[in-house]
């Protein structure tokens, strides 16, 4: 028996369902009574789901997994993982045994989009050219860790005096806070871009500082 999985990682958004595809080629006359199917975590061999003795043995992994029972006899051994969590990320091995056996691993990459950044300024009044100001760009509930870029109004990257911190919450999602310290010119626009490297999703925020009231 030869087991086939997708070579590319499966990307799944947090709280959505994901399908880890796995297939094998049944011989003529194959019956489910002959099938021994195991899904397990590659790195620990922890059992996730199994099908033996002609029966779906069910989920051994937080009761969020399911097979496609009607498709098994055709060689579809794919696994459905419901309500994906950050902690589900990793490699899953599909092991099929009939007369002989084979296995293959598929990677699950979990992702969550970052929120539109909010911008704050300190100090936020009585600003004069030459003042040192701190601009904070905050974006929330994303995964995996973000890449943060700052630019001025002309699109020139600002790399000095930038401090970025990323903190995971209890669900494993990251809140990003990036701080830019800059000396004010006569006026100027400062943009922050928060990029999710897996989703290739960019979230933009900007603040324009003039002699007049601030605009965000």
């Amino acid at each position: 028996v030869e087991v086939q999985v997708s070579e590319d990682p499966v990307v799944a958004l947090v709280d959505t369902d994901a399908t880890l595809r796995c297939s094998f080629s049944p011989e003529p006359g194959f019956s489910l009574a002959q099938l021994n199917l195991i899904w397990q975590l590659t790195d620990t061999k922890q059992l996730v789901h199994s099908f033996t003795e002609g029966r779906d043995q069910g989920s051994a992994y937080s009761n969020r997994t399911a097979l496609f029972p009607d498709l098994l006899v055709q060689g579809n051994a794919s696994l459905r993982l419901q309500r994906v969590r950050v902690t589900d990320e990793g490699s899953y091995t599909c092991f099929v045994s009939i007369q002989d056996f084979d296995s293959a691993a598929v990677s699950l990459q979990v992702a969550a989009p970052y929120s539109k950044p909010s911008m704050t300024l300190e100090p936020n009044k009585d600003l004069r050219p030459g003042n040192m100001v701190t601009i904070t760009c905050s974006s929330y509930q994303g995964y995996p860790e973000a890449e943060v870029f700052w630019k001025d109004g002309q699109g020139v990257p600002l790399t000095g005096n930038v401090t970025t911190s990323q903190m995971a919450n209890e669900r494993g999602l990251f809140d990003v806070h990036s701080v830019l310290r800059v000396v004010l010119g006569a006026n100027g626009t400062y943009s922050c871009l928060v990029r999710n490297p897996v989703l290739q999703q960019d979230a933009h925020g900007s603040v324009t500082i003039t002699g007049q009231p601030l605009t965000f």
Partner: antibody
Framework: EVQLLESGGGLVQPGGSLRLSCAAS????????MSWVRQAPGKGLEWVSG????????YYADSVKGRFTISRDNSKNTLYLQMNSLRAEDTAVYYC???????????WGQGTTVTVSS | QSVLTQPPSASGTPGQRVTISCSGS????????VNWYQQLPGTAPKLLIS??QRPSGVPDRFSGSKSGTSASLAITGLQSEDEADYYC???????????FGGGTKLTVL
């Protein structure tokens, strides 16, 4: 040729320590889980410990938990078993074995003898 | 007390067929590969059969089968050099441990 070669066995007093090594050759060591299995004189085979290919996951038999530590150095193609607080009942031939993706210990070393006695 | 149960001994005459049984549970043999090892006196164990698959170099006189939570090893055309200890083994995903049978000493009469 696929080969596993154990070393480090010997005579040690109860409460003492010993470190076993298993040198692997002829295959991509870093791609395989590995195990230690022992056999007391005149007795059957007893699994001792296992470790994942990267070393991130380790498992132990209840009889050695907290006393033995399995580790590996993939750059040196070597598996280790650090044995502390040794007891007379740890006296055995210790084998290292390759543990493949199909849950088969398919290649075994020739074994190294550990004797715990005062 | 071993997790997998094997008869302690078996015997046969040259040319005969002998079988050795191994009984386990759903968390080991029931869904995991069952392996059979031959250990000749004074040597390391050697893989003989996995489920019903023979590694290259193992004579086709040796065969394995598995049904439910039990497995068996059959040896046909018994030869004097088959006299050895035979062990079944499987990964147990409830115990997170390899489990072995107590071993069966095969005597060729």
């Amino acid at each position: 040729e696929v080969q596993l070669l154990e070393s480090g066995g010997g005579l040690v007093q109860p409460g003492g320590s010993l470190r076993l090594s298993c040198a692997a050759s002829g295959f991509t060591f870093s791609s395989y889980w590995m195990s230690w299995v022992r056999q007391a004189p005149g007795k059957g085979l007893e699994w001792v410990s296992g470790i994942s290919s990267s070393g991130s996951a380790t498992y132990y038999a209840d009889s050695v938990k907290g006393r033995f530590t399995i580790s590996r150095d993939n750059s040196k193609n070597t598996l280790y078993l650090q044995m502390n607080s040794l007891r007379a009942e740890d006296t055995a031939v210790y084998y290292c074995a390759r543990w493949n993706d199909y849950d088969i210990m398919d290649v075994w070393g020739q074994g190294t003898t550990v004797t715990v006695s005062s | 007390q071993s997790v997998l149960t094997q008869p302690p001994s078996a015997s046969g005459t040259p040319g005969q067929r002998v079988t050795i049984s191994c009984s386990g549970s759903s968390s080991n043999i029931g869904r995991r590969t069952v392996n059979w090892y031959q250990q000749l006196p004074g040597t390391a164990p050697k893989l003989l059969i996995s489920n019903s698959q023979r590694p290259s170099g193992v004579p086709d006189r040796f065969s394995g089968s598995k049904s439910g939570t039990s497995a068996s090893l059959a040896i046909t055309g018994l030869q004097s050099e088959d006299e050895a200890d035979y062990y079944c083994a499987s990964w147990d995903d409830s115990l997170n441990a390899w489990v072995f049978g107590g071993g069966t000493k095969l005597t060729v009469l």
